[in-house]
């Protein structure tokens, strides 16, 4: 998906006020320097690339945080404010079916979650140059 | 403007089971969570779960192991819960409440008229 | 699970005294998730205030929420005849989402 025509302020807006709190609570009892950060993204479309790809798709060692309150907050946004976003998403939620029967908070699944905290924040200051 | 309008009122058997539908009207139906909310004769309100209609991804409640489905048809924009197994306990009205950003936040900010399940020998 | 209680189950005023309904949360929650609604005899259920504090749409100034964590309050601050119903209390931080048990406000 092509997330070039986001409403980026309102998702923006929903991030601060809800998503954000919830990524707080999924990380509650997690030292802020506990995980490096190694994603990044460069603007605002990228950005939502790369959440999406850390909030729903299955990777090794976290294959359950599509089941959590913030990624369905986050598919409410995008899906809102993202012309088309709910149409594409078909096949790949089938996809991932079977790997979401479960939902175990892992070390791993923190140190994503983490990634996705920085990855919104970058979302969150798109002027600033890449460091 | 965003409507939601249930089907009507059911009497069932113990045992058997029941389908109701929700149809929206006023919004993208594919875009926005659908939840359904019961509430047993004089009693408060109870979640049952979720669906996303845009990939069908659903959230249920576990108290209900396995005996509500809830699914929805996009090419009418309808959302449905079926519930087996029925009790008499289940006697309630049945509700379902979109989930929506407002002001920023999310909730339920629209819900059906509310369909009454009876279920009775 | 997170279990919502309200108190007082029932709360009898007179037209134009103040009501406070309490809503204690079994584990801290964020305030943008604590939601409440008002519901009459044979209606839905309607949002009235969203994230702890702010009015549902067409909701008077005399209702008002605050709090924070595992302590909430939604307070009318003159009861007219129409505010007469049940409030329930809401969270949207965890699985299964839940609601309180509800305070019905009844004329003295």
């Known amino acids: 998906y092509d997330f070039t025509n986001c409403d980026f302020e309102k998702i923006k807006a929903a991030y601060l006020s809800t998503i954000s709190k919830d990524l707080i609570t999924y990380m509650s009892g997690t030292k802020s320097t506990e995980f490096n950060n190694t994603v990044s993204c460069s603007n605002r479309p990228h950005c939502l690339t790369e959440i999406q790809s850390l909030t729903f798709n299955p990777t090794a060692g976290c294959a359950s945080l599509a089941k959590e309150m913030f990624a369905m907050k986050t598919k409410a946004a995008l899906a809102i404010w993202c012309p088309g976003y709910s149409e594409t998403q078909i096949n790949a939620t089938q996809a991932m079916k079977k790997a979401r029967k479960s939902k175990v908070t892992t070390n791993k699944c923190l140190e994503q979650v983490s990634q996705l905290q920085g990855l919104w924040r970058r979302f969150n200051r798109p002027l600033l140059k890449q460091q | 403007q965003v409507q939601l309008v249930q089907s009507g009122a059911e009497v069932k058997k113990p045992g058997s089971s029941v389908k109701v539908s929700c149809k929206a009207s006023g919004y993208a139906f594919s875009s926005y969570w659908m939840n359904w909310v019961r509430q047993a004769p004089g009693q408060g309100l109870e979640w049952m779960g979720q669906i996303f209609p845009g990939d069908g991804e659903t959230n249920y409640n576990g108290k209900f192991k396995g005996r509500v489905t809830i699914t929805a048809d996009k090419s009418t924009s309808t959302a449905y819960m079926e519930l087996s197994s029925l009790r008499s306990e289940d006697t309630a009205v049945y509700y379902c409440?979109?989930?929506?950003?407002?002001?920023?936040?999310?909730?339920?900010?629209?819900w059906g008229q509310g369909t009454t399940v009876t279920v009775s020998s | 699970e997170i279990v919502m209680t309200q108190s007082p189950a029932t709360l009898s005023v007179s037209p134009g005294e103040r009501a406070t309904l309490s809503c204690s949360v079994s584990s801290s929650i964020s305030s943008s998730n604590l939601h409440w609604y008002q519901q009459k005899p044979g209606q839905s259920p309607r949002p009235w205030i969203y994230?702890?504090?702010t009015l549902a749409s067409g909701i008077p100034a005399r209702f008002s929420g605050s709090g924070s964590g595992t302590e909430f309050t939604l307070t009318i601050s003159s009861l007219q005849s129409e505010d007469f119903a049940v409030y329930y209390c809401q969270q949207w931080s965890s699985y299964p989402l839940t609601f309180g048990g509800g305070t019905k406000v009844e004329i003295k």
């Open positions: 994230g702890t504090s």
């Open positions: 409440a979109r989930g929506g950003y407002v002001n920023f936040l999310y909730a339920m900010d629209y």
